[in-house]
Interface confidence: medium
């Protein structure tokens, strides 16, 4: 039975040219995390594998940094970076947990963090 929940940074805003941390946290389960996939829409950005460590897609290598923790840091943001991001936690023995983050990239300097929310 899957008892865990994923807490994410929720809906977030950031300025064009700035940077943002995408963060997910898996709680309420003793399952072992074997891998975390980070996706933008259906494009694979990065994986953090328990054995292999971090790998960042070559397309994003200049602007994406691993961490903190199992999170991902996006730098030099452009308007094309706006949209949905998913963290997919592969765990044993529970299976997979998915969290969603929506990023808005603003032209102006009125960027505010949205509230944290939970995805079961």
């Amino acid at each position: 039975m899957m008892t865990g929940t994923i807490e994410t940074t929720g809906n977030i805003s950031a300025e064009k040219g700035g940077s943002i941390i995408l963060q997910c946290h898996l709680s309420s389960t003793t399952a072992q995390v074997t891998q975390v996939n980070w996706e933008q829409q259906d494009q694979l950005l990065a994986i953090c594998n328990a054995d292999l460590g971090w790998h960042i897609s070559p397309s994003f290598k200049d602007r994406v940094a691993p961490g903190p923790g199992l999170g991902l840091t996006l730098q030099s943001l452009t308007v094309n970076d706006a949209g949905e991001y998913f963290c997919i936690y592969h765990t044993y023995p529970d299976g997979t947990y998915t969290g969603r983050i929506f990023l808005e990239v603003l032209e102006s300097s009125v960027a505010e963090h949205g509230a944290r929310f939970q995805i079961p």
């Epitope: 259906d42 694979l44 054995d51 790998h55 070559p58 397309s59 592969h90 997979t96």
Partner: antibody
Framework: QVQLVQSGAEVKKPGASVKVSCKAS????????ISWVRQAPGQGLEWMGW????????NYAQKLQGRVTMTTDTSTSTAYMELRSLRSDDTAVYYC?????????????WGQGTLVTVSS | AIQLTQSPSSLSASVGDRVTISCRAS??????LNWYQQKPGKAPKLLIY???SLQSGVPLRFSGSGSGTDFTLTISSLQPEDFATYYC??????????FGGGTKVEIK
């Protein structure tokens, strides 16, 4: 263009070891993982494991744990797969393959294959 | 480990036929499903990645569909060079990566 060139066919006795090489060219070697896949005569494809060319970290198929070692030499852009304590059922064609990021880790380029025959 | 079940294991078809091959995963793999073609004595060749994206250089008669657990490879009009064995592979979980058992497409 991207190329993976493997070493030549090998004939080994049961209990011996074999080391197959896979020389990569045409791309940044350390940006991708290399997987090894084998195919016994008349059988399907079996994933053996994967090595990160970035940091040398590995994960191996459970059934081969303890018998297989995968390494890379970044100075020559070469991956190696060593299989020890060979048995007759290890007779197979061994392939190296690059895991493509844009292909969500699908194997976009393959070596030509190395036939390893285990026979007394 | 995620299991992939291909069906049928073999099929006979004629040039010009529409051919469909199924791949079912034992749990959801979202769109992390790839299709390969392998001819005797040759390395596999990536045809479709991410369930429905055509790999560069692959003819448009090949297409893929599905997400979650059920996926299909379709060859709209079978050509003589398409007689081969086709494999699906999941890359959703790399512990381990797994292949389907293969589907052999033979000449009727």
């Amino acid at each position: 263009q991207v190329q993976l060139v493997q070493s030549g066919a090998e004939v080994k006795k049961p209990g011996a070891s074999v080391k197959v090489s896979c020389k990569a060219s045409g791309y940044t070697f350390t940006s991708y993982g290399i997987s090894w896949v084998r195919q016994a005569p008349g059988q399907g494809l079996e994933w053996m494991g994967w090595i990160s060319a970035y940091n040398g970290n590995t994960n191996y198929a459970q059934k081969l744990q303890g018998r297989v070692t995968m390494t890379t030499d970044t100075s020559t852009s070469t991956a190696y797969m060593e299989l020890r304590s060979l048995r007759s059922d290890d007779t197979a064609v061994y392939y190296c393959a690059r895991a493509g990021w844009e292909q969500q880790l699908g194997f976009d380029y393959w070596g030509q294959g190395t036939l390893v025959t285990v026979s007394s | 480990a995620i299991q992939l079940t291909q069906s049928p294991s073999s099929l006979s078809a004629s040039v010009g036929d529409r051919v469909t091959i199924s791949c079912r995963a034992s749990q959801t793999i979202r769109s992390y499903l790839n299709w390969y073609q392998q001819k005797p004595g040759k390395a596999p060749k990536l045809l479709i990645y991410a369930a429905s994206s055509l790999q560069s250089g692959v003819p448009l008669r090949f297409s893929g569909s599905g997400s979650g657990t059920d996926f299909t490879l379709t060859i709209s009009s079978l050509q003589p060079e398409d007689f081969a064995t086709y494999y699906c592979q999941q890359s959703y979980s790399t512990l381990p990566l797994t292949f389907g058992g293969g589907t052999k497409v033979e000449i009727k």
